[in-house]
Amino acid sequence: QTSVSPSKVILPRGGSVLVTCSTSCDQPKLLGIETPLPKKELLLPGNNRKVYELSNVQEDSQPMCYSNCPDGQSTAKTFLTVYWTPERVELAPLPSWQPVGKNLTLRCQVEGGAPRANLTVVLLRGEKELKREPAVGEPAEVTTTVLVRRDHHGANFSCRTELDLRPQGLELFENTSAPYQLQTFVLPATPPQLVSPRVLEVDTQGTVVCSLDGLFPVSEAQVHLALGDQRLNPTVTYGNDSFSAKASVSVTAEDEGTQRLTCAVILGNQSQETLQTVTIYSFPAPNVILTKPEVSEGTEVTVKCEAHPRAKVTLNGVPAQPLGPRAQLLLKATPEDNGRSFSCSATLEVAGQLIHKNQTRELRVLYGPRLDERDCPGNWTWPENSQQTPMCQAWGNPLPELKCLKDGTFPLPIGESVTVTRDLEGTYLCRARSTQGEVTRKVTVNVLSPRYE
């Protein structure tokens, strides 16, 4: 009778094992082991027992002990089971961003590992088991479908293999794949709302606002604002599930014409875009030209108004004849025209909008000086000791200097409240003088003495 010890062995791949072959007869003609494995016999006293070291065990094997005894030949097998953990445990790659509501298929591939009967594949979300299946096939593949929810955002999905050798007196060997972190997002089907001026004047600034509601996670949304080739630098304000991106846009003469304003929102692997056209125009204020801004009374003055070639102008409310970018009027300057405003209003149509520009110029008419009876009476008769205010107003532009002197040296206090005395009596020569010339007027002050009865 041939026996083998141990009859069953579980050992790690590439490991070694000592196998003892024994026979029941004392003098066997033959005692040995049959195996493809590298073997080394260990010398022992006696003839009925032999010990072999089998090495580099790579796969399951059944070495066989045999013996030839006088009563016949017999054999005994030992069962070597090789165990090893998988060489590859991998989740099939997936885009990290997944839209909420999508069915996401997780696929785990396992290469190698034995014994397969003891090898299980587990799919997990965090620590929660989603699916558990034995490893079948090479490579073994386990799949599960997950409906992506908002609360899955940031969750880690992984695949774990479990080689359970505890029934064989060994331990549970676990291998885990690299985790796949899921980023969930919601990008609504509605395009972003874009608020901007439809027309924008050269060398001015406009404000562009792009906004969108119903985003998740809003902080991860990227906003791209551009006017033509000019990237805008918005200030983004976030709400719970919304954002508002505000940018200042400056345009120059080079941008003149129709430009495309774009707002693109990128979240995950999706984007939404809104396009709008902005017309950039140049429209300088009309020019009001006076032949001279300052003229003397009686001078002929031409007032011209010139504007953008496509504009239509009105000068002091009167439209140009024919309607167009130029208007003019002629006048003879009078004192009443001093300080008169000449206003030119120009209107230009840009992208269906009417743009208005105004320019005003003031005419200065130099006239005078004037001293007349109404404003500078020639005769005053006042009671002695009464309080009086001598009034004499000179007119002209520029406003004349006025002085009233008696005998060329004694002043009359114009506009002052004076006590009337005999000294005040007399004839005063009032002289109004300006750059336009001078005029004089005689003013007589009579003082009435109190009558004593």
Epitope: G408, T409, F410, P411, P413, V418, T421, R422, D423
Partner: antibody
Amino acid sequence: VEESGGGLVKPGGTLTLTCTVSGFSLSSHAMGWVRQAPGKGLEYIGIIGSSDRTYYASWAKGRFTISKTSTTVDLKITSPTTEDTATYFCVRDPYDSYDDGYRLWGPGTLVTVSS
Amino acid sequence: AYDMTQTPASVEVAVGGTVTIKCQASQSIYRYLSWYQKKPGQRPKFLIYDASKLASGVPSRFEGSGSGTEFTLTISGAQSDDAATYYCQQAYSSGSIDNAFGGGTEVVVK
């Protein structure tokens, strides 16, 4: 504006000082006479207006007479006393004037009253 | 009568200092007041008219103010050349030219 006629005069005599003007018309300017006795302040004697009307300090009435021609203004001193020893100035536009920034003064002429 | 009273009679000021001279009229002369500078052996120099207006060529360190009966002449940043006697003169009434000038203020610059 330039004064002349000053010098030594005996008390009780008569002295006429003359102010000669050029560059302006006396018909449109008043002229005045001011004096300053040694160690004393300025004091007005009198003024002749552009209309030839005269105005005198109360102490000068009767002893001083102002008159004018087209280019001169005279100050006649009758019966001077030693108190009248002073420098006599002729001034254009003594009070106010149409030409604000100017008051023309002569260099003055010294009158010494002594026996 | 329009009597003009000037104070102080004499004042001392250091170079660069400020001096203030007051002039009071016995009754209102409105703004009709002139200021003169008088140095020995020289004709009076016209400084200010209408109480506050600088005569032609007068430096801005001279400043006049006031109206009615109270007037002031201020010399800021006094210079040695400002040593002189200063007179105010009423330039209003023809009725009395007695005491048209103030008594004068002697300014000594040290």
